[in-house]
């Protein structure tokens, strides 16, 4: 049962009072207000929005609301020297140029300061050369090209379709393959759902629509010039040559009309199989270069973007806890957008705004949460999670001692089919219990719980009768809290039906067409899915901040640790001979997982039996729960990724968006058969097993009786 107890207030001020105060009409109104002009990070418009949110959060009743500013490296196109791509003939004449901007959506023709499509942090350059089509530019795509097809990308410009993995990983892979430039495009196979019209008549991507986005490989560093430390007034900044994660080759995104013009001329090798074909009427030849008649033509990139140290602003609101003010539950989401941000981020920011308003209403009636709640409107998320990371770097000592949980609040919707949750196993029970108490907004599930519709539409692949809850990866503002600091984290949003809609993300992601009207007309006219997401996010925050005993269940960590140990062992056993030769044993890890399981169960027994009226014992038990996630942090970090310090989870080295379990062991095993020094490679596997086993055992011991 949820405890839902309130502090110093009448019994009516419980979770129900908080949830009942959340209104769909308010979320709709806030979304409209946040999406009328662009709010690009580092611009005056986004600074003004920060001040507006600060003022409104104060009006809503928060105890304090401050702006926290940092001077970080951002990237912008050159206003007078636009970026584009050409096809040039043998004389160097440009016979085709890609478009310089997206055709604006109806009603927005006169809006100024719409940033044209660009790949943030691309270096300047004008490379020219033959084109190679590299599918999604995933690790496995380059393996196919280089190992199976013997195609060399060195000195070539590669063209890759968006989707499947984070764009920064695509660029990194292209760099490693020796490419001298990257063209990213949205293929209709991934960004045009069959049977749906293009915007403004539907939610599909028109041919002139383009996905913006950063192409960094920061690995959790935050501002590229001040890794590990806040970009404050007295910061020491690295030189640009030493900056973290910047790409070394020019990169530019285009839409599928322009991509058609480049791809239709491709010659060379045929695509290796159907998985390399998109939906354009082109052969999807891999190249290199154009076919017969066009073989003397080349592709030329013209990139003139600049990197600039620019001021950004987070808004930090505080609702002080009545009993444990030194314990922080954080709800955070970003405010900066590429253009209008109709979905990303403002569908999330509008929900946060309404959650703040509801909490403020309760506070004005005399209520306070047990623990302190911090609300954050992050800046520069789109430029590499910079606002959240800099703030966490500045406040890391407080956070590691006082941080109970972080709930992320970016886009509330990426579809309108069912709930999607990624979180620490500590929150599984909380999410299950909460969704059982909430009404489903789904058609056909009237009078049924959200848990029921979610479980029916998105069943767990491993555990029947339960909903799917995914591992946390990255690509959003929870990263620093979870992967670096080890603060229990979670995120929730409404999503599409992944079975029937195989496109990546939502079609209009990071385009100019991500408007208020997109949401209001096509995704959520009644704002009922937004309201449900507000209830899930807000309900989690309420329970985390207000329950007497923290709503974390360490037994669920035991369950997943066993699953992950089984999985990584199975991967390793694909090399039985090497396992024997190099005496690789997983016994220590399996033993540690068993010990964790045993200790976690005994802890749970004590948790049910202890005297909750004894504040010292209560605090002690809660601290053991709070610090469990912290116990999975290795202060030395993962190999070559010092800011990814969680031993159980890290963003995949091949896709920042995805989470990988036992990432140290996984990466040590990855493609191990191709390593030049197998003895050294298997030695690293053994070292990573040792680190994982030690960490799991050490975490288990934090749950043991203290004396």
């Amino acid at each position: 049962k949820s405890s839902n107890e309130a502090t110093n207030i009448t019994p009516k001020h419980n979770m129900k009072a908080f949830l009942d105060e959340l209104k769909a009409e308010n979320i709709k109104k806030f979304l409209y207000n946040f999406t009328q002009i662009p709010h690009l990070a580092g611009t005056e418009q986004n600074f003004q929005l920060a001040k507006q949110i600060q003022s409104q959060w104060k009006e809503f009743g928060l105890d304090s609301v401050e702006l926290a500013h940092y001077d970080v490296l951002l990237s912008y196109p050159n206003k007078t020297h636009p970026n584009y791509i050409s096809i040039i003939n043998e004389d160097g004449n440009e016979i085709f140029n890609t478009s310089l901007f997206e055709p604006p959506p109806p009603g927005y023709e006169n809006v100024s300061d719409i940033v044209p499509p660009f790949s943030a942090f691309s270096p300047q350059g004008m490379p020219e050369g033959d084109l190679v089509y590299v599918n999604y530019a995933r690790t496995e795509d380059f393996f196919k090209l280089e190992r199976d097809m013997k195609i060399n990308c060195s000195g070539k410009i590669v063209i890759a379709r968006y989707g499947k993995v984070f764009r920064g990983n695509k660029v990194k892979n292209a760099q490693l393959a020796g490419a001298k430039g990257v063209i990213l495009y949205s293929d209709p196979a991934d960004y045009f759902a069959p049977g749906v019209k293009s915007y403004p008549d539907g939610w599909n991507l028109p041919g002139g629509g383009v996905q913006r986005g950063n192409i960094l490989n920061l690995n959790g560093a935050g501002d590229p010039l001040t890794p590990g430390y806040p970009a404050n007034e007295y910061a020491y900044r690295r030189g640009i040559a030493e900056a973290v994660g910047l790409p070394s080759i020019p990169v530019h995104p285009i839409g599928y009309y322009d991509a058609q013009k480049l791809l239709e001329k491709m010659g060379g090798s045929a695509p290796p199989d159907s998985s390399w074909r998109g939906s354009l009427k082109v052969p999807y030849n891999v190249g290199p270069g154009f076919t017969g008649n066009f073989s003397t033509q080349k592709v030329k990139m013209h990139i003139h973007s600049t990197n600039e140290v620019t001021r950004i602003y987070n808004v930090i609101g505080t609702l002080r806890g009545a009993v444990e003010p030194d314990r922080y539950v954080i709800l955070g989401g970003h405010r900066d957008s590429w253009v209008f941000g109709g979905i990303d981020p403002q569908s999330g920011a509008a929900v946060v705004h309404e959650i703040v308003r509801s909490f403020g209403t309760l506070k004005k009636e005399g209520w306070r949460p047990r623990r302190t709640i911090l609300f954050a409107s992050w800046d520069a998320e789109e430029f590499g999670l910079l606002g959240s990371t800099e703030w966490a770097e500045e406040n890391s000592r407080l956070l590691q001692e006082r941080g109970v949980a972080y709930i992320n609040a970016d886009s509330s919707i990426e579809g309108n089919y069912t709930l999607r949750v990624d979180c620490t196993p500590l929150m599984y029970s909380l999410v299950h219990n909460l969704t059982k108490e909430l009404k489903s907004p789904d058609e056909g599930f009237e009078g049924k719980s959200l848990y029921e519709s979610w479980t029916k539409k998105s069943p767990s692949p491993e555990f029947s009768g339960m909903p799917r809850i995914s591992k946390l990866g990255s690509g959003n503002d929870f990263e620093v809290f979870f992967q670096r600091l080890g603060i229990a984290s979670g995120r929730a949003r409404y999503t599409k039906n992944w079975e029937t809609n195989k496109f990546s993300g939502y079609p209009l992601y990071h385009s100019v067409y991500e408007t208020y009207e997109l949401v209001e007309k096509f995704y959520d006219p009644m704002f009922k899915y937004h309201l449900t997401v507000a209830q899930v996010r807000g309900g989690m925050v309420f329970e985390l901040a207000n329950s007497i005993v923290l709503p974390f269940d360490c037994r669920d960590y035991a369950v997943v640790l066993r699953k992950y140990a089984d999985k990584i062992y199975s991967i390793s056993m694909k090399h039985p001979q090497e396992m024997k030769t190099y005496s690789v044993s997983f016994d220590s890890l399996f033993s540690a997982v068993k010990n964790f399981t045993e200790i976690a169960s005994k802890f749970s027994e004590r948790l049910q039996d202890f005297d909750k009226s004894n504040p010292i014992v209560l605090r002690m038990m809660n601290d053991q729960l709070m610090f469990l996630e912290r116990a999975f942090i290795d202060p030395l970090g993962l190999p070559d990724r010092p800011f990814y310090r969680h031993v159980i989870y890290a963003p995949s080295s091949h896709n920042k968006y995805a989470g990988e379990s036992f990432p140290g062991i996984y990466d040590a095993l990855f493609d191990i058969e191709s390593k030049v020094d197998p003895s050294k490679a298997w030695g690293e596997v053994k070292r990573q097993i040792y680190v994982a086993a030690f960490t799991v055992q050490a975490a288990a011991e934090t749950l043991s009786e203290v004396a």
Partner: antibody
Framework: EVQLVESGGGLVQPGGSLRLSCAAS????????MSWVRQAPGKGLEWVSA????????YYADSVKGRFTISRDNSKNTLYLQMNSLRAEDSAVYYC??????????????WGQGTLVTVSS | QSVLTQPPSVSAAPGQKVTISCSGS????????VSWYQQLPGTAPKLLIY???KRPSGIPDRFSGSKSGTSATLGITGLQTGDEADYYC???????????FGGGTKLTVL
Amino acid sequence: EVQLVESGGGLVQPGGSLRLSCAASGFTFSSYAMSWVRQAPGKGLEWVSAISGGSGSTYYADSVKGRFTISRDNSKNTLYLQMNSLRAEDSAVYYCAKDGVGATPYYFDYWGQGTLVTVSS
Amino acid sequence: QSVLTQPPSVSAAPGQKVTISCSGSSSNIGINYVSWYQQLPGTAPKLLIYDNNKRPSGIPDRFSGSKSGTSATLGITGLQTGDEADYYCGTWDSSLSAVVFGGGTKLTVL
């Protein structure tokens, strides 16, 4: 003292359903994985299903996947096995067993006395 | 057909020693902990050995367990007529995500 008492067995026709219960006492029920293990007459032990402590993650033998559902009610200290689309080969004594370690199955330190399920027309 | 392989039967005279083998693979016995159960005629199984070689309280030290590679062994010394029973090995299988048992071994005390 740990006690596990199964009930709900009986005679059922092929294609029919039955719900088994296991009442547990003498330990903190919610903290331990619980399993159902069956034994056909004159045959060996066959693990059927398990449910973890905590959120109640479930595991099934291939032979019963999609037909049987394990669940638990921690407030009632009771384990259940809902058996649908029963077949003759499901006839067995069904034992409820407690895990000896914690939230996932390692070994069974306590067993109930079993309840007989007979599937026959 | 069981995932773990046991001999169908073993026999020995009272006072003698007997061993029962249990053979598996890298995904079960090879990496996971083995337990052994005794089932006397007409009764529920009872835990005899856990974690490869540990005895629950009340189990005499005549019973022992060991594991090597992908095989496990149950040893019984000083056989008594009361030891006549079926013996089962069990473990977790990391590939199947399932508990697996051996087919059982009938011990006859001659």
